[in-house]
Interface confidence: medium
């Protein structure tokens, strides 16, 4: 029951945590299960124990085997087992199943791939990421802390993702790689969160008194048929139709445009002959659908003629 599988590649660092947990103050002793020989704690050894952690720096195929850890407290002892397998590095690109960590699934709205076991290591950014052995390039991929974020996930993004990082131990660097599969699931064809593309939250829009001004409220709602999706403008919390200012009107822009498969809506607010009092109003762009509502607020400011000239 208190046994844990751990694996790694030869010549890489491998750190294993004792499957039995205890307070940091408790001592943990590590042994080779077959020989009952104690594992040293001195860091000059290639394999050494450091509290709850057993460190292979670097690992060798011959290190494979079962290791016993005993968590000792004043009142009890707890025993755990770490089943460690070290594999030879593959010459080809394929990552065999036995080296794979748990599969994660993502969607258009949630595409984080966490680097497995990284929290055991003393590493510094950046993390390197590979898909099917190819280094990931392009603005859609963002290595963020201990995970990879993929923007606008598509079904083609499914595959095996490998993270590579450097573990530092007393000034010496060791390489670590870990691979897991990523699958893409369709979130039932719609998004729960309207995303307002424009305007930005609390945007200040510069306008010229006496001229016409247009404000566009643009939001996307997900893929496929959208229930109750709408975008609209409010002035000081009141719908345009109820506000009673004929100079200010809204009209639908593109209806349900499917760029990138996303269902989006636009609503343009047209202000004719901008007046001083228009600068005092609060303009709210609202995006709502079946599941909720998001609001972005815009205010108008007078365009400085000097700025205009420059």
């Amino acid at each position: 029951k208190f046994s844990k599988q751990s694996w790694g590649l030869e010549n890489e660092a491998l750190i294993v945590r004792c499957p039995r947990q205890g307070k940091p103050s408790y001592t943990v002793d590590w042994y080779y299960s077959q020989t009952n020989k104690s594992i040293p704690t001195q860091e000059r050894n290639r394999v050494f124990a450091s509290g709850q952690l057993l460190k292979f720096l670097p690992a060798a195929v011959a290190d494979s085997g079962i290791y016993t850890c005993i968590v000792r407290s004043p009142t009890f002892n707890r025993t755990g087992y770490a089943n460690v397998t070290i594999y030879k590095k593959q010459s080809d690109c394929n990552v065999p199943d036995y080296l794979m960590y748990s599969t994660v699934s993502g969607s258009e709205k949630n595409s984080k791939i966490y680097c497995p076991t990284i929290d055991l290591y003393n590493w510094t950014a950046p993390l390197e990421w590979f898909k099917n052995c190819q280094a990931l390039q392009g603005s859609r991929y963002r290595a963020h802390k201990s995970f990879l974020v993929i923007d606008n996930v598509m079904t083609e993004d499914a595959g095996d993702y490998t993270c590579k990082f450097i573990h530092n131990e007393n000034g010496a660097n060791y390489s670590v790689t870990a691979t897991r599969s990523f699958t893409v699931k369709d979130e039932q064809g719609f998004s729960l969160f309207p995303v307002i593309g424009a305007p930005a939250q609390n945007e200040i829009k510069e306008v010229e008194i006496g001229k016409n001004a247009n404000l566009t409220c643009s939001a996307c709602f997900g893929k496929g048929t959208q229930f109750l999706a709408a975008v609209l403008w409010q002035l000081n919390g009141t719908k345009i139709t109820d506000f009673g200012e004929p100079r200010i009107q809204q009209e639908e822009g593109q209806n349900q445009s499917f760029s990138n498969g996303l269902a989006c809506l636009d609503m343009v607010l047209r202000i004719a002959d901008v007046k001083e009092e228009d600068l005092l109003l609060q303009y709210d762009c609202l995006a709502l659908n079946l599941h909720g509502l998001r609001r972005h607020t815009v205010r108008l400011s007078r365009k400085n003629p000097i700025d205009h000239h420059s």
Epitope: V231, L293, R295
Partner: antibody, heavy 128, light 113 residues
Framework: QVQLVQSGAEVKKPGSSVKVSCKAS????????MHWVRQAPGQGLEWVGV????????TYAQTFQGRVTITADESTSTAYMELSSLRSEDTAVYYC?????????????????????WGQGTTVTVSS | DIVMTQSPDSLAVSLGERATINCKSS????????????LAWYQQKPGQPPKLLIY???TRESGVPDRFSGSGSGTDFTLTISSLQAEDVAVYYC?????????FGQGTKVEIK
């Protein structure tokens, strides 16, 4: 306080239409969804449709598609549900119910959830 | 459509005892992006409209006594009345609002033994 007051009971002939009203008070009408749910005698609850008064958009259960129209009059904070081509199996109590709203500061988003305020119900009897 | 199935159809419990109602959805109503279960529970007493008790599967609506609690995730949910009171005699419905159409369970009638 927040309340929904529905129009009185109706007796209708098969093939005719009925329009039930639901007057909201005590909250900003356009900020909340309004659902319509019906309950046949001795039966469970059946969702009819919903309107977002703020955007005016509606969606209906497939069962009622083409026969039901939900509208909202913001000036009077009243929602309406009109059901046409009535048949005897439409005999039921019709409820309007406000969709609950919960603000999430982390998402800067207003979630709609469940139905937190209900009207008293309007009995519609369809009989020849 | 997501089908909601409640069990049992009726339940007789002694005053002060625990009452448990189960609700199963034909597909998950957990939206992983916000980790919320789009499930609500309602109480309906004879001649009255339903009353919202629980939303997001486990959040008690304000004013609802704390003897009512909701639990579960994904497809399996439970409404528990920890100590049944006389005023709790009613029909209880679960409802998903994850997708259109919104659907209800068939109801569970709770009576006093």
């Amino acid at each position: 306080q927040v309340q929904l007051v529905q129009s009185g009971a109706e007796v209708k002939k098969p093939g005719s239409s009925v329009k039930v009203s639901c007057k909201a008070s005590g909250y900003t009408f356009t900020d909340y969804q309004m659902h319509w749910v019906r309950q046949a005698p001795g039966q469970g609850l059946e969702w009819v449709g919903v309107i977002n008064p703020g955007g005016g958009s509606t969606t209906y259960a497939q069962t009622f598609q083409g026969r039901v129209t939900i509208t909202a009059d913001e000036s009077t904070s009243t929602a309406y549900m009109e059901l046409s081509s009535l048949r005897s199996e439409d005999t039921a109590v019709y409820y309007c119910a406000r969709g609950g709203v919960e603000y999430s500061s982390s998402w800067d988003y207003y979630y709609y959830y469940g139905m937190d305020v209900w009207g008293q119900g309007t009995t519609v009897t369809v009989s020849s | 459509d997501i089908v909601m199935t409640q069990s049992p159809d009726s339940l007789a419990v002694s005053l002060g005892e625990r009452a448990t109602i189960n609700c199963k959805s034909s597909q998950s109503v957990l939206y992983r992006s916000n980790n919320k279960n789009y499930l609500a529970w309602y109480q309906q007493k004879p001649g009255q409209p339903p009353k919202l008790l629980i939303y997001w599967a486990s959040t008690r609506e304000s004013g609802v006594p704390d003897r009512f609690s909701g639990s579960g995730s994904g497809t399996d949910f439970t409404l528990t009345i920890s100590s049944l009171q006389a005023e709790d005699v009613a029909v209880y419905y679960c409802q998903q609002y994850y997708s259109i159409p919104v659907t209800f369970g068939q109801g569970t009638k709770v009576e006093i033994k």
